[in-house]
Interface confidence: low
């Protein structure tokens, strides 16, 4: 807390400029009018204030706006934003995407700080949903942003926003998140033709059910092994050898290298060995010829 002292004669700030960097903390407190600071916030960024001096400037704004800063001030905070606490930011009402971009720029290149996370949370809640422009902006600054949301939070993402998602934005998503995102992507891309649709939907297929994989196998998509290995095991297990062969196309050769890993390993265990042999890849571990396969899950469903 800076002690209240009278401003020395001739030191009253008429504008926010470089001369203020030579002011002591108490002089800044006494000689800079908070309303002047608020109207000239855009100048603060260009002046190399010390962290201690920034603390004083923040204190003056806090006194002027105890209920939270107006957006006109927030937009021009610049590196003073780094001095804000999540508690400060919770008082703000940020509605402009330009304001959000300006503040994200300050934190660019760093991990999402608690301040930034709170800012994004306030902004998204204010908008009511993660619209396309917001998602575009957030994933540009933080490619992992989408995968940092809980499945519950992802459920508020409208299908139209999915167009903004790039494959790298989904790199760190887990199956539960893809379960939520996949139906939205399917809806978003539903009017595209086969090959274009596959290019767009590919990154989301970790959330696809068996029936969609069966449908894709009829479309000559040539899924690569990296995508296949990210599919849900429970979605892959019911696929026949012929369906997997069609789904992977020329990439089917890669099954041999992955035969000990999920979901390939579990899928092999469910296939007849003579069906696997038709692939000519030397895949072993299928159900021996002559054995009867009982689908107990189907029997339970019927009883």
């Amino acid at each position: 807390e800076v002690e209240k002292t009278a401003c020395p004669s001739g030191k009253k700030a008429r504008e926010i400029d470089e001369s203020l960097i030579f002011y002591k903390k108490w002089e800044l407190e006494a000689c800079v009018d908070a309303a002047l600071l608020a109207t000239q916030m855009d100048r603060v960024n260009a002046i190399p204030f010390t962290y201690e001096q920034l603390d004083v400037l923040k204190h003056k704004l806090d006194e002027l706006y105890p209920q939270g800063y107006p957006e006109s001030v927030i937009q021009h905070l610049g590196y003073l934003f780094l001095k804000m606490s999540p508690e400060d930011i919770r008082k703000w009402n940020v509605t402009s995407l330009e304001t959000l971009k300006a503040l994200l720029e300050v934190n660019k290149g760093h991990e999402m700080s608690p301040q930034v996370a709170t800012l994004i949370d306030r902004f998204v809640k204010g908008r009511g949903q993660l619209d396309k422009d917001t998602l575009d902006t957030l994933t540009a600054f933080y490619p992992g942003y989408l995968c940092s949301l809980s499945p519950e939070e992802l459920s508020s993402v409208p299908p139209s926003s999915i167009w903004a998602v790039r494959p790298q934005d989904l790199d760190t998503c887990d199956p539960r998140q893809l379960d939520v995102l996949y139906p939205k992507a399917r809806l978003a891309f539903q009017n595209m033709n086969g090959s274009e649709y596959f290019v767009k939907i590919q990154s989301f297929l970790g959330g696809a059910p068996t029936e969609d994989l069966k449908a894709l196998s009829q479309q000559n998509v040539s899924m690569d092994l990296a995508t296949f290995m990210k599919l849900r095991t429970d979605a892959v297990l019911p696929l026949t050898v012929a369906e997997v062969q069609k789904l992977l196309g020329p990439h089917v050769e890669g099954l041999k290298a992955e035969e000990r890993h999920r979901p390939v390993r579990d899928w092999i265990l469910r296939q007849r060995q003579d069906d696997l042999d038709t692939l000519g890849l030397g895949l072993q571990g299928g159900i021996p010829n002559g054995y009867l396969v009982l689908d107990l899950s189907m029997q339970e469903a019927l009883s």
């Epitope: 999540p86 809980s150 760190t172 887990d174």
Partner: nanobody, 118 residues
Framework: EVQLVESGGGLVQPGGSLRLSCAAS????????MGWFRQAPGKGRELVAS????????YYPDSVEGRFTISRDNAKRMVYLQMNSLRAEDTAVYYC???????????WGQGTQVTVSS
């Protein structure tokens, strides 16, 4: 109620190693990111490592990159900080912290003292 309890601090010589542990209870760990912060006397809290609970995305500031490693065991609800090549400037109280995804670090442990001195 969320509880974070750190252990593993102590006195170590420069160049030595320590492994800090943080036991978490009272929440579904998968919905949280975890971090380690430190606070040296007279200084503010500094984030030294964080890890995303959905994946293994980690973050380290330049001051500890290559020396510190954060890891987690979701099943045991544990978070670890392996600190190698320790320096005198690493002396601080180290805090374990947790956050809900998309929010600031809101849950803190009591801290464990790490002193690097010969």
């Amino acid at each position: 109620e969320v509880q974070l309890v750190e252990s593993g601090g102590g006195l170590v010589q420069p160049g030595g190693s320590l492994r800090l542990s943080c036991a978490a209870s009272g929440f579904i760990s998968n919905f949280y990111a975890m971090g380690w912060f430190r606070q040296a006397p007279g200084k503010g809290r500094e984030l030294v490592a964080s890890i995303n609970s959905y994946s293994d995305i980690t973050y380290y500031p330049d001051s500890v990159e290559g020396r510190f490693t954060i890891s987690r065991d979701n099943a045991k609800r544990m978070v670890y900080l392996q600190m190698n090549s320790l320096r005198a400037e690493d002396t601080a109280v180290y805090y374990c912290a947790a956050r809900w995804q998309g929010q600031g670090f809101g849950y803190w442990g009591q801290g464990t003292q790490v002193t690097v001195s010969s």
